[in-house]
């Protein structure tokens, strides 16, 4: 179960927005707050550990999951082309 | 079978640029993080670039970074490695290379190319 | 930097134990990577212990603790080649970049 703390926008900048999200999740042993269909949820903790994002399936049904190169985070891919990227801190 | 065939190396003066080319076939171009490994004469293997499925997000070895830039074209299923200001120490065979379940890291490579000779002199 | 020994002989039959320890801890595992003179790159495991289905069974991958080895079980003649390993490493300026050992040179007695 999970609940979401706070949530800044920010849409200063032209055809961006920049969204700032907190969660708190009540997780069993062994998993840990994370990203499911877009939504905040408790996901294996393991996933976290070992930065393979897209195994939490972060993005909603019909988008493609993309790993950042460095690991910080992944993208969001809509069919229609439009990139959402979520980093991770 | 995957095949990636690289193109575009030969002989290069010191400062100038070249472009790279690896097509890709035998797999899903779109669905998988490509990048670039080079190995000098005589010399072990060096990480070049690597770049994501979408094409949004790349990353440089330090040798190259700021003179490099890694792109895609997933119609044509052909990676892209632009180098410029080309120094003798570039010299090397540049192998493309494909990232295993969807992403790449230099401990989940499962196919190479053959690789393209670049030599840099005057 | 990845450390990995120079070389390493066996004789046919024998097994063949070619070690890598360094790089970062970025849970993708360990690369091994074997060269033939004059020939790309050919993957023989990837992701610690995960092997191409075009790559014999002799071939296999183990990690304990921060040491991570490649064996070759029943050495055969063709298996004689530099062996490289691949990791990550982690810097703040670049993030995880690809980093390979200098290669083992496997020599069949």
């Known amino acids: 179960t999970c609940e979401i703390v706070t949530l800044d926008r920010d849409s200063s900048q032209p055809r961006r927005t920049i969204a700032r999200q907190t969660a708190r999740c009540a997780c069993r042993k062994g998993q840990i707050a994370g990203t499911t269909r877009a939504r905040p949820a408790c996901v294996d903790a393991r996933i976290i550990k070992t930065k393979q994002w897209c195994d939490m399936l972060p993005c909603l049904e019909g988008e493609g999951c993309d790993l950042l190169i460095n690991r910080s985070g992944w993208t969001c891919t809509q069919p229609g082309g439009r990139i959402k990227t979520t980093t991770v801190s | 079978a995957v095949t990636l065939d690289e193109s575009g190396g030969g002989l290069q003066t010191p400062g100038g640029a070249l472009r790279l080319s690896c097509k890709a076939s035998?797999?899903?171009?779109?669905?998988?993080?490509m990048g670039w490994v080079r190995q000098a004469p005589g010399k072990g293997l060096e990480w070049v670039s690597a770049i994501n499925k979408s094409g949004s997000d790349t990353s440089y070895g330090s040798a190259v970074k700021g003179r490099a830039t890694i792109s895609r074209d997933n119609g044509q299923s052909t990676l892209y490695l632009q180098m410029n200001s080309l120094r003798a120490e570039d010299t090397a065979v540049y192998f493309c290379a494909k990232g295993s379940a969807s992403y790449i890291t230099a401990a989940t490579i499962d196919a190479w190319g053959h690789g393209t000779e670049v030599i840099v002199s005057s | 930097a990845l450390t990995q020994p120079s070389s390493v002989s066996a004789n046919p039959g024998e097994t063949a134990r070619i070690t890598c320890s360094g790089g970062a801890s970025s849970g993708y595992g360990y690369g091994w990577y074997q060269q033939k003179p004059s020939s790309a790159p050919l993957t023989v495991i990837y992701k610690d212990s995960e092997r191409p289905s075009d790559i014999p069974s002799r071939f296999s991958g183990s990690s304990s603790g921060s040491t991570h080895t490649l064996t070759i079980s029943g050495v055969q003649a063709e298996d004689e080649a530099v062996y490289f390993c691949g990791n990550d490493d982690y810097s703040s300026d670049s993030g995880y970049v690809g980093v390979f050992g200098a290669g083992t040179t496997l020599t069949v007695l």
């Open positions: 035998g797999f899903t171009f779109s669905s998988y993080q």
